[in-house]
Each structure stands twice: as C-alpha cells, then as structure tokens.
Interface confidence: low
C-alpha cells in the first residue's frame, strides 16, 4: 500500500537550514506529484508547496517562496524540502502529501515531522511542586501538582506515583514563554484525608536534555 | 488566491445528532473542493472529494453538497470516532487552500469548575521568579474567564493559559492559568486573587491567598 | 488582462478526432490549473476536462473518459485536449480556462 514516511524536523535557530525527506513506497514515485503542507501548533492547515512528477515545475506558497526549495530523487522514491532562513513562524508539522492518481487533493499523507525554530538552546526543566493546602481544598478533595517551568524543546512526559496514578490527572499543554522556554503544569485532585498518609510525587522526563526529576509534592509545612 | 471560510469554528453535539459544517469559497470554485478529517497527533484523513463523492472506506453517514462558492458537510448521524476537526480544501487553483477548521466536540452538560491556587514555592522563590497558579478543575461549556488581581489591582499581561482536550470521560475541560513575577514584584504585594467566571456559577468565584500566610 | 485562444474545432464525422489547442497569451497560465468546458445549444456549460499546473494529474468527466485526453505545454503555453471516438453528443462549443479566464470557445460538429 501507498506510504510516506518523513524525516529531517528538528529544532533549528532562526536564520539557519534544515531539509525534510519523504521516502515514498508501494507506487511508482516518478508518476506522481506530491506537496508539502504544514500545521503550526494549535493552528489549521497550510499549503506549502509542490513539485510536479516529472520535476518540470515548483510552485511555493508567498510566505516561503524564496525561502524553501522543493526537490525529489526518483531514484531514491524521495521528495525533499529544502528550508532556508528559517523564522519562528515556520515551526509547524511538516507533512508531505500525494494526490490521487487522476484529482488534485491529497488522497496519501505522511505521519508529519515538526520543525521548531528557535533561538533558545536544549535547557532542562526546573521542577517546582504545586502543595495542596486550605486553598486547594474543595468538599472533600484536595488538589496538587508541579509546574514544570522553562525547559527547550519540547517535549517532555509526566506521571505520578511512577504511573501508578492516573485517576483525576490533568497535564496541560505546554505554553510557549517570552523567554523562548516552555513551561506546564500537571495537577492531581485526591481525597483531602489522604494527604497525611499517601505520598505524591510527579515523574518529570525531559528526554532533549537527559533530564529526569521526581519530585515529592506535600502539604506546606507551617 | 481563493480565500475558504469555515464555520462554525466550534461545534458542540451529541453521538446520534446530525451536524453540518459549512464551507465558503470567495470566487466559484465549481465542485472542486475535498474535506478531510484530523484527530489530535495524526495526519489529515480525505473523506469527501469533488464536493460530494464519498472517499473508499469512509461511511456513507458523511454527506457532501455543494457547488460554486457554498459546500456543507453534513454528518448524518454522529458517532464517538467522529468527534475531530474537519477541514475543506478547494483544488481549483494550485495554491491549495485550505478552511481553518471546524472542532466537532462532544455536548456535555453545564458543569461549574472547582477553583484551587497555587502560591509559588519557596524553591522557585530562591530562583528568583514567582508563579501563581490557578487551577479550574472539569467544567463545561469550555468557555471561561479568569482574572488576576494583586492587592485588588487587576492584572495584564503577565499570565498565560493553557487547557485541557476535552475528557473522554465526562465531557469537560481543565484550564491552568500562571501569574508569573519577579521576586522582588511578588515581595511587594500581599494579596493575590484570581476570580473565575463560568456559565456554570451563579456569580463569579474568588480564590485568594496572603503572601506568607500558611 | 491574460487571454486565451482556442482553436482546432470543426466538423468531423462519428467515430472520429479533433485535437483542440488553447494559447495563453504570457505565462499566467503555467502555474495554474487548466480546464476545457463546453456548451452545447440551449444547455448548460459543463466540465470536460482539466489539468494541474505541472501537467502531471488530470481529470475527466464521466462521459468523455477513455476518449479524450487533457495534456499541456508550459514552453508554449499552450494546453491540448485530443478528442477520440466522437460521438454527436459531443458537438458543442469548447471553451478553456485558467483560473477566472475564459477563452472564447471553438465549435466541435460531429456528423451522423
């Protein structure tokens, strides 16, 4: 059957180059036109450019034109993107896309590859916990968490209790801080009279930067 | 280039309930136009093209109409693997262009949240940042507003958001907002607040703290 | 104001074929998708045929597929429609179009 898997994201600073593949499988490559289309975080679907099978044409979106170059290697069944002076608004989800063999919409897609720009540098996080008190007390239910505060690029995983809790977790997407560092909070409601016996501790892994944290998160002390 | 609007941008309903999404082209685009179906972390899946043929595989539930400049979705029944965003595509032009999406998220029923803050720890406080948290635990309509006030003076600019995908579960939402300050601007005020306002609350909640107080 | 000119209508006999060409008059039409329509008297114009930019994908009307064939020339700006195994409902005055353009359409007879 018909694949497109992708290669190539990555973080990148601002300014520089970086090239994405899409090896193609299961058709005859040459015969086809494929495009590249993006999706910035939370955002729609943006159409980036495309190559014509018999590589005789490129036709690029305004805001990458001059930018991105579009290349394919019938040889190797790949298509390339070729991103220059790269800026922050093209991160975004890279995906390559075939049409149908007789229409023109995209009927195959690739699993997408994310492209960060940025000028932050790999940071671990800091961990700092979220006590429960009188002030996240609510009927009976207490809440608590960790702020996982200023690390680059995403992502990273949290769990409590090495996984043994999950009931009444919210982790939050992560949001981007003026600084260029990411930041998020993972929360937990567990019964108030459980406090002074369970113990919570959230399980922080930043896997960019080899950094993991376990954190015991407790009633404050007065 | 041809311009696609979608709406609504947001549409919230029940398994069984018939939805339709809307899709507007600024010029005629003839029946050239294809919708595709996106869940959270995955590629885009093509349902429908030439404005009203059904891609192979995908239930005949899933209706396209629609030609010129006007085009609807309409999904006959809805059912649990539908909740996703949908997107048109015209291909008249070769400047593919997309609609900005329409969410199709599940109706849940009026839930109020419950309200919890976070004063900084002292670890953070020895870094020399300060963030406040305000925790809106499982409610619904997604909709809600939080402000922050500092010795009752409203606060601007120094937060920031973040929400939860709806629960699979229950239907609702979760929303974290952080103040975050220098040490030394926290060390200046007493009072830190932050007030929720929900169609779920009869009048807005106030969650407070004394800095230093237990 | 980008033009387009079509040309290689004309009469022909049941079972036979026409080649019909539309030149653009500059490079507008080289990055854009192609179409033929048609119109027959006292119908509505329909879709024939259109191709991609690039040449490279194609698409037919379910009542000329087999038969015709959409093909281009970004060097001469020029888009081709081959017509194979005329039928009399086939005659009708063929327009081509690039993006919000017409040209001003060359007549097809086809002979019983």
């Known amino acids: 059957q018909v694949q497109l898997v992708q290669s190539g994201g990555g973080v990148v600073q601002p300014g520089r180059s970086l090239r994405l593949s899409c090896a193609a499988s299961g058709f005859t490559f040459s015969r086809y036109t494929i495009h590249w289309v993006r999706q910035a975080p939370g955002k729609g679907l943006e159409w980036v450019a495309v190559m014509s099978y018999n590589g005789n044409n490129k036709h690029y979106a305004d805001s990458v034109n001059g930018r991105f170059t579009i290349s394919r290697n019938d040889s190797k069944n790949t298509l390339y993107l070729n991103m220059n002076s790269l800026r922050p608004e093209d991160t975004a989800v890279y995906y390559c896309a075939r049409i149908r063999d007789t229409a023109m919409f995209f009927a195959h897609w690739g699993q997408g590859t994310l492209v960060t720009v940025s000028s932050a540098s790999t940071k671990g996080p800091s961990v700092f916990p979220l006590a429960p008190s009188s002030k996240s007390t609510s009927g009976g239910t207490a809440a608590l968490g960790c702020l996982v505060k200023d690390y680059f690029p995403e992502p990273v995983t949290v769990s409590w209790n090495s996984g043994a809790l999950t009931s009444g977790v919210h982790t939050f997407p992560a949001v981007l801080q003026s600084s260029g560092l990411y930041s998020l909070s993972s929360v937990v409601t567990v019964p108030s009279s459980s406090l002074g016996t369970q113990t919570y501790i959230c399980n922080v892994n930043h896997k960019p930067s080899n950094t993991k944290v376990d954190k015991k998160v407790e009633p404050k002390s007065c | 280039d041809i311009q696609m609007t979608q709406s609504p941008s947001t549409l919230s309903a029940s398994v069984g309930d018939r939805v339709t999404i809307t899709c507007r082209a600024s010029q005629s685009i003839n029946t050239w136009l294809a919708w595709y179906q996106q869940k959270p972390g995955k590629a885009p899946k093509l349902l429908m093209y030439k404005a009203s043929s059904l891609e192979s595989g995908v239930p005949s539930r899933f209706i396209g109409s629609g030609s010129g400049t006007e085009f609807t979705l309409t999904i006959s029944s809805l059912q649990p693997d539908d909740f996703a965003t949908y997107y048109c595509q015209q291909y008249n032009s070769d400047s593919k262009m997309f609609g900005q999406g329409t969410k199709v998220e599940v109706k849940g029923t009026v839930a109020a949240p419950s309200v919890f803050i976070f004063p900084p720890s002292d670890e953070q406080l020895k870094s020399g940042t300060a963030s406040v948290v305000c925790l809106l635990n499982n409610f619904y309509p997604r909709e809600a507003k939080v402000q922050w006030k500092v010795d009752n003076a409203l606060q601007s600019g120094n937060s920031q958001e973040s929400v939860t995908e709806q629960d699979s579960k229950d239907s609702t939402y979760s929303l974290s907002s952080t103040l975050t300050l220098s040490k030394a601007d926290y060390e200046k005020h007493k009072v830190y607040a932050c007030e929720v306002t929900h169609q779920g609350l009869s009048s807005p909640v106030t969650k407070s703290f004394n800095r230093g107080e237990c | 104001q980008v033009q387009l000119q079509e040309s290689g209508g004309g009469l022909v006999q049941a079972g036979g074929s026409l080649r019909l060409s539309c030149a653009a008059s500059?490079?507008?039409?080289?990055?854009?998708?192609m179409a033929w329509f048609r119109q027959a008297p006292g119908k509505e114009r329909e879709f024939v045929a259109r191709?991609?930019?690039?040449?490279?994908?194609?698409e037919y009307a379910d009542s000329v597929k087999g038969r015709f064939t959409i093909s281009k020339d970004n060097a001469k700006n020029t888009v081709y429609l081959q017509m194979d195994s005329l039928k009399p409902e086939d005659a009708a005055v063929y327009y081509c179009?690039?993006?919000?353009?017409w040209g001003q359409g060359t007549q097809v007879t086809v002979s019983s």
């Open positions: 500059d490079r507008y039409f080289s990055s854009h998708t």
């Open positions: 179009a690039a993006g919000p353009y």
């Open positions: 191709v991609d930019w690039s040449g490279g994908s194609t």
